[in-house]
Structures are given as structure tokens and as C-alpha cells.
Interface confidence: medium
């Protein structure tokens, strides 16, 4: 049943990238607001984002706390402007979620490149290490730290004379391959959870860094970082 | 389908060393770590180590360090396990796992028996 | 290293009742727990990890739960096809560690 003139909330998707974590779901509100619970499996119902007209909620702060349990999230509708009124004991209509483990599920965002370095036949190339909203012990977790050796990186590198694609893979945040003296390359990177079963293993490919794009660089004889 | 198949039985003097292999098929064989478990008669599970299939890199149990050897051939998807100075107690029957997601062992070996006696 | 230890060493329950088998560790894995089933003679198979989640194929008659130190496996009606040795293990911190099992029989 339900309370009058309310509609249960449908469509409930989560939306997750590097544990940044939105529960979206529809109806847009007519005359009606809602509030979210999460819970763990085990656990009790934590309510969030109280009588609101949104359709979506940042569950972030609560997922953080152990990425690796499943959480099962509702979502209640109320009539606008009789939230604390109604008078009625009646339990106002509601939608479960899918159940969702940060851990497995959480999408891996766009990595960047944050420097390469050539010294003469050698290239070192750095992923940058994002952070997370992960915590422990009062400090933030990059995404390495939590994945360990979950997260991998793949290197896609070619010469800017031709589109031949090389790769290379590597379980830190750093590359070392070797290139032709006097070719300037191109770099992408993708992180990687090679075990994930699921859509979600890859991430988009980081934005091309080229070598050779700034002026006055001298790539033969010295060091060069390009930092964003 | 999933499948790591083990190599046979073996009985091995006290000193001496003993490989075991381990060859995986049905899955992206370097996107996964290759576990080894023992199991000694009548006795619990003993995590020995792992190693990536795609670096080679390894980890081994403290207890193991000195005598294990974890090795892997990406041409023919195999992982191998040498233990070196046997003794009697190494007597016990030796499992590849694979390393799921996450940290648990999802896939095992048939197992391998190695028997160490004079 | 990581003990932990299963408790009871053996248990023997009757079919279509209730089997609970409890694991400790010595100090916190989160939910850092996977639990295994092994049949005489056969490898171990995997049923729950992260503490509750049951493995692809694994019967719902089988469930995890628990958190910090304190698990518990549970097999809420026992077939004859469950009777095996069951495992605990931390894959929380390594050396991943095994608890020393415990024996299943039907009463």
C-alpha cells in the first residue's frame, strides 16, 4: 500500500567510480521527497539525504568505512510538506537496491600520466596515484594502496611517425621501456583489475602525452618531466 | 572452463629438491596470481606462496623462504614450485591455487602428493 | 602471522538441522575471510568471501558473517553431500593463514 500520493522510487543504480559512490534512482519528485538508508549486510540502517527532492545521494562517507562489504541501500518516499505531520503509522513506500561491494564493483577512473623521463634509449613513465575517499588511520588512500596488487597498469606507446601500438604492463605506477634514439613517443595508460570477471576491470585510457610537445626541449641528452 | 592440472606423485629422498608444476587453462592466465597450498596427512592447509604469471614476481611464506623457488612459463601457461633440502615433514600433498579478486583462493589443483622417505 | 583458530574441532549434526562452525583471529582482518569446504580425497572449494559472500554455484544454505576477530559459517539445513572438513582463512594480511579445520559429520 503506502502512504497517499506517493510513489516508490525504481531504477535504483549505483554509480561508483573510484569509490566516489552516488545511488541514483527515479522518479523526479512530484510532491514527494525522499530519504535513503544504507546498511551492511549485518549491520543497521544508516539514513542519508533526508527528505529530499533529488534523485540522488552520495553514500561515499559510508562506503569508505570498508569498501570490501556489501551494502544494500532503500530509498522512501514522502509527501512533500507533510513529512513530520502525516499523523499515519503507515510505512511510507520504498525501493531496495542492488546489493554492491565497493571493492569488486567500483569503476577505475581515467588514470593520468603524470611524468616521463628519457635518459637515452630508456624511458621511465609515472601513472599518477589518485587518491581515494578511502581512509586509514585519519589518512586518505591512494588507489594503489587500497587495490595492492589487485590494480595493474597497462602502457600503450608508439612512435608519432606511425601508429603501430606497443604495450607494457606493470604492477606499480611505473614504467621502464626502451625506445629508439632520436623518435620522439607518444603514452596512454589504462588501469587494470585483470581478475574482475566484469565490465568494469578497465578503465578508459588515460589522455596521449607525447614527447616532443614543448619547446626548447632537448630529449637526447637530458632528463625531461612533464608534470600536469 | 577453468582448470589447473598438476603434475604426478613424487617420492624424493631427504635432501633433495622436488618440482612441482601447474598448468592453467579456460582464463587469461597472466591476469591472475598462482598460489601454492600444502597439506600434510591428516593435517590443515599452509599457505606457501604466490607468483604473478605476468611479472614472475614472487612472495613467499617466511617459513618457506630459503628452500622455495616459485617460477612461471607464460608460452605454455604453467607455474612451477621447487622445494629444495626436504625433509620428512615435507611429506604432504601440494596445491596451486588461484588468487581471486580480493585475496581468496577460487580455483585449485588436483593437488600433488610428495612423499619424502629414506 | 595471523592464528586463527576454528572451533569446534568436530561437529556431528543430525539432517536438515542447523550447523554452526566459529573462527577467531588473532587480531583484526576486517572482513578480510574466506571459508572453504574440502571432501575427503578432493581440493578445497571456495564458499563465502569478504565474510558473507557466498561463491558463484555455492548453495544458499551456506552463509558468513561476522567482522574484526569473530566469523561463523553457517549451514542452516545439513545435506549428507555437506559432510567435509571446513576451513577458515585471513586474506587480510600476509602470510594468508588457515585455521586447523573443523570435521562435519551427520549425527
Known amino acids: 500500500s503506502g502512504t497517499t500520493n506517493t510513489v516508490a522510487a525504481y531504477n535504483l543504480t549505483w554509480k561508483s567510480t573510484n569509490f566516489k559512490t552516488i545511488l541514483e534512482w527515479e522518479p523526479k519528485p512530484i510532491n514527494q521527497v525522499y530519504t535513503v538508508q544504507i546498511s551492511t549486510k549485518s549491520g543497521d540502517w544508516k539514513s542519508k539525504c533526508f527528505y529530499t527532492a533529488d534523485t540522488e545521494c552520495d553514500l561515499t562517507d559510508e562506503i569508505v568505512k570498508d569498501v570490501k562489504q556489501t551494502y544494500l541501500a532503500r530509498v522512501f518516499s514522502y509527501p512533500a510538506g507533510h513529512v513530520e505531520s502525516t499523523g499515519s503509522t503507515e510505512e511510507p513506500p520504498y525501493e531496495n537496491s542492488p546489493e554492491f561491494t565497493p571493492y569488486l564493483e567500483t569503476n577505475l577512473g581515467q588514470p593520468t600520466i603524470q611524468s616521463f623521463e628519457q635518459v637515452g634509449t630508456k624511458v621511465n613513465v609515472t601513472v599518477q596515484d589518485e587518491w581515494t575517499l578511502v581512509r586509514r588511520n585519519d589518512t586518505f588512500l591512494s588507489l594503489r594502496d587500497v587495490f595492492g596488487k589487485d590494480l595493474i597498469y597497462t602502457l600503450y606507446y608508439w612512435k608519432s611517425s606511425s601508429s603501430g601500438k606497443k604495450t607494457a604492463k606493470t604492477n606499480t605506477n611505473e614504467f621502464l621501456i626502451d625506445v629508439d634514439k632520436g623518435e620522439n613517443y607518444c603514452f596512454s595508460v589504462q588501469a587494470v583489475i585483470p581478475s574482475r570477471r566484469t565490465a568494469n576491470r578497465k578503465s578508459t585510457d588515460s589522455p596521449v602525452e607525447c614527447m616532443g610537445h614543448e619547446k626548447g626541449e632537448s630529449r637526447e641528452t637530458g632528463h625531461h618531466h612533464h608534470h600536469h | 572452463e577453468v582448470q589447473l592440472v598438476q603434475s604426478g606423485a613424487e617420492v624424493k629422498k631427504p635432501g633433495a629438491s622436488v618440482k612441482v608444476s601447474c598448468k592453467a587453462s579456460?582464463?587469461?592466465?597472466?591476469?591472475?596470481?598462482m598460489n601454492w597450498v600444502r597439506q600434510a596427512p591428516g593435517q590443515g592447509l599452509e599457505w606457501m606462496g604466490e607468483?604473478?604469471?605476468?611479472?614472475?614476481?614472487?612472495t613467499y611464506n617466511q617459513k618457506f623462504k630459503a628452500r622455495v623457488t616459485m617460477t612461471v612459463d607464460q608460452s605454455t601457461s604453467t607455474v612451477y614450485m621447487e622445494l629444495s633440502s626436504l625433509r620428512s615433514e615435507d611429506t604432504a600433498v601440494y596445491y596451486c591455487?588461484?588468487?581471486?579478486?580480493?585475496?581468496?583462493?577460487?580455483?585449485w589443483g588436483q593437488g600433488t602428493t610428495v612423499t619424502v622417505s629414506s | 602471522s595471523i592464528v586463527m583458530t576454528q572451533s569446534p574441532d568436530s561437529l556431528a549434526v543430525s539432517l536438515g538441522e542447523r550447523a554452526t562452525i566459529n573462527c577467531k583471529a588473532s587480531?583484526?582482518?576486517?572482513?578480510?575471510i574466506a571459508w572453504y569446504q574440502q571432501k575427503p580425497g578432493q581440493s578445497p572449494k571456495l564458499l563465502i568471501y569478504?565474510?558473507?559472500n557466498r561463491y558463484t554455484g555455492v548453495p544458499d544454505r551456506f552463509s558468513g558473517s561476522g567482522y574484526g576477530t569473530d566469523f561463523t559459517l553457517t549451514i542452516s539445513s545439513l545435506q549428507a553431500e555437506d559432510v567435509a572438513v571446513y576451513y577458515c582463512?585471513?586474506?587480510?594480511?600476509?602470510?594468508?593463514?588457515f585455521g586447523g579445520g573443523t570435521k562435519v559429520e551427520i549425527k
Open positions: 569478504f565474510a558473507s
Open positions: 582463512q585471513q586474506d587480510y594480511s600476509s602470510p594468508w593463514t
Open positions: 579456460g582464463y587469461s592466465f597472466t591476469g591472475y596470481y
Open positions: 591455487a588461484r588468487r581471486e579478486l580480493g585475496g581468496p583462493f577460487g580455483y
Open positions: 587480531q583484526s582482518v576486517s572482513n578480510g
Open positions: 607468483i604473478n604469471p605476468s611479472t614472475g614476481g614472487s
